[in-house]
C-alpha cells in the first residue's frame, strides 16, 4: 500500500476547521476490515486518531479529531482537526495498513490575522518640528509573532530608534507593540506595517503630524 | 507603565454580596483579555473568572451563577461581582492581564465571616 | 484537590539544578500551553514562563520550562537563595472551559 500526502503544509487559520489529506489506494475487494489507520503526532509519537478492527476508535486528541467514514473504502484517509488552536502545529503522520503498511507525514501550519494596527502618540500635543516624540504602533491575536516595519512619508524604511515588543495570551495569540521614536520634522506621515509571515498579510497603520490637528 | 489597582474588598456576612474593582492604567484596556484569581488564607492560587476583550465571559465551576465579571471600556475598569458569598470565598483577591495574567495588581482582601 | 499535580515541596542547594514538576491530563497540559509563576513570601505572583517555554522580559535564563505529553516541568539551574518561593503552573482545561492552576510547589534553599 502506497499512503500519498500534500507536500506543502497546510495552513489553518485559528477556531477553524483544517483537513490533513491521506490517501491510499485500495486493492479490488478491499473491505474496511482489513484497514489499520492511524494518525499520530510525528515528534511524540502521541496516537490523534485511528481507525482498526472495523470501526472507527475516535479521537485520542482533545475531541476535536474526525475521519471521513463514507469515503475511508475509497482510500480517502484524512484527518480532520476541529476549531484549531496555536498547540495544533506541528507534523502529523498517517500509517496505513492493510496487509503491508506505509506511512507519511503532513505540517499543519497555525495562523491568525492581526488586527488593524492602533497608533498613539506621547506627547499628543503642543507638537513643534524638533521635538523628540514616541509613536507606538499596536496591533492584536495574531499568530504566529509578527515582524513590523517603519517608514516614513516617503516610504523610506526607518529602523533606528524602533522597539518591538509582543506578549501572548494563554492560547498562544500574541499582541505586538512597536514603539518609534523620532524627531518631528514640520509635517510628516509615519506608517507602520504589521506583517503575518505565514498569512503575508499586512496591516497598516499611520499618523499623521502637521500644524492642524493630528490625522490616524 | 502597566499598573492594576484593584478595591472594594472588605468585611461582610455569609450570604452577602460585594463588589470588586480593578482600575487598568498604562495599556489600552479594551484590547485585552482580563481575570480574576484568588488565594484564600495560606492556600494556592486559583482561577475565579475571565473576560476576553470582546466580553464572551468564563468562571471556575467554584464560583459559577454566583459571581459576575464585567467590564467598562469606557472607565478602563474591570469588576467582579460577588453574591451569595460563602466563607470559603474568603481571600486575596487579584485582577490581571490576560488568563495568563502577565500582569497583576496589589490584591485586595474579602473577608467572609459573621 | 487541583486537576494540576505538583509536588508541595522541592529543595536543592546554591548553584545546584532543581526540576518542579507539573501533571495533568490530555484536557490541559497534553493540547494546551503551560504557564509557571513565582510567588515571593508576601507579594503578588508573577509570571515567571509562558507559552511553555518563553521567559517575560527581565526572567533570568536560569529559569527555563518544558512540556512532554501530558506533564510540564519548570527547571531552575545555578540556585539562588532569593529563589525561595512558592512556584505554580497553569493551563487552560477543555473539559472544564476554564484557566486552572497547580496546587503550588514550595522551594526551599538549604
Known amino acids: 500500500v502506497e499512503v500519498q500526502v500534500s507536500e506543502d503544509p497546510v495552513v489553518a487559520l485559528v477556531d477553524t476547521d483544517a483537513t490533513l489529506r491521506c490517501s491510499f489506494s485500495p486493492e479490488p475487494g478491499f473491505s474496511l476490515a482489513q484497514l489499520n489507520l492511524i494518525w499520530q503526532l510525528t515528534d511524540t509519537k502521541q496516537l490523534v486518531h485511528s481507525f482498526t478492527e472495523g470501526r472507527d476508535q475516535g479521537s485520542a486528541y482533545s475531541n476535536r479529531t474526525a475521519l471521513f467514514p463514507d469515503l475511508l473504502v475509497q482510500g480517502n484517509a484524512s484527518l480532520r482537526l476541529q476549531r484549531v488552536r496555536v498547540t495544533d502545529e506541528g507534523s502529523y503522520t498517517c500509517f496505513v495498513s492493510i496487509q503491508d503498511f506505509d506511512s507519511a507525514a503532513v505540517s499543519l501550519q497555525v495562523a491568525a490575522p492581526y488586527s488593524k494596527p492602533s497608533m498613539t502618540l506621547e506627547p499628543n500635543k503642543d507638537l513643534r518640528p524638533g521635538n523628540m516624540v514616541t509613536i507606538t504602533c499596536s496591533s492584536y491575536q495574531g499568530y504566529p509573532e509578527a515582524e513590523v516595519f517603519w517608514k516614513d512619508g516617503q516610504g523610506v524604511p526607518l529602523t533606528g530608534n524602533v522597539t518591538t515588543s509582543q506578549m501572548a495570551n494563554e492560547r498562544g495569540l500574541f499582541d505586538v507593540h512597536s514603539v518609534l521614536r523620532v524627531v518631528l520634522g514640520a509635517n510628516g506621515t509615519y506608517s507602520c506595517l504589521v506583517r503575518n509571515p505565514v498569512l503575508q498579510q499586512d496591516a497598516h497603520g499611520s499618523v499623521t503630524i502637521t500644524g492642524q490637528p493630528l490625522t490616524f | 507603565e502597566v499598573q492594576l489597582l484593584e478595591s472594594g474588598g472588605g468585611l461582610v456576612q455569609p450570604g452577602g454580596s460585594l463588589r470588586l474593582s480593578c482600575a487598568a492604567s498604562?495599556?489600552?484596556?479594551?484590547?485585552?483579555?482580563m481575570s480574576w484569581v484568588r488565594q484564600a488564607p495560606g492556600k494556592g492560587l486559583e482561577w475565579v473568572a475571565g473576560i476576553r476583550s470582546g466580553s464572551r465571559t468564563y468562571y471556575a465551576d467554584s464560583v459559577k451563577g454566583r459571581f459576575t465579571i464585567s467590564r467598562d471600556n469606557s472607565k478602563n475598569t474591570l469588576y467582579l461581582q460577588m453574591n451569595s458569598l460563602r466563607a470559603e470565598d474568603t481571600a486575596t483577591y487579584y485582577c490581571?492581564?490576560?488568563?495568563?495574567?502577565?500582569?497583576w495588581g496589589q490584591g485586595t482582601t474579602v473577608t467572609v465571616s459573621s | 484537590q487541583s486537576v494540576l499535580t505538583q509536588p508541595p515541596s522541592a529543595s536543592g542547594t546554591p548553584g545546584q539544578r532543581v526540576t518542579i514538576s507539573c501533571s495533568g491530563s490530555?484536557?490541559?497540559?497534553?493540547?494546551?500551553?503551560v504557564h509557571w509563576y513565582q510567588q515571593l513570601p508576601g507579594t503578588a505572583p508573577k509570571l515567571l514562563i509562558y507559552?511553555?517555554?518563553r521567559r517575560p522580559s527581565g526572567v533570568p535564563d536560569r529559569f527555563s520550562g518544558s512540556k512532554s505529553g501530558t506533564s510540564a516541568s519548570l527547571a531552575i539551574s545555578g540556585l539562588q537563595s532569593e529563589d525561595e518561593a512558592n512556584y505554580y503552573c497553569a493551563t487552560w482545561d477543555d473539559s472544564l472551559n476554564s484557566f486552572l492552576f497547580g496546587g503550588g510547589t514550595k522551594l526551599t534553599v538549604l
Open positions: 490530555t484536557f490541559n497540559i497534553g493540547t494546551n500551553l
Open positions: 507559552l511553555t517555554d
Open positions: 490581571g492581564r490576560y488568563f495568563n495574567m502577565d500582569v
Open positions: 498604562g495599556f489600552s484596556f479594551s484590547n485585552y483579555d
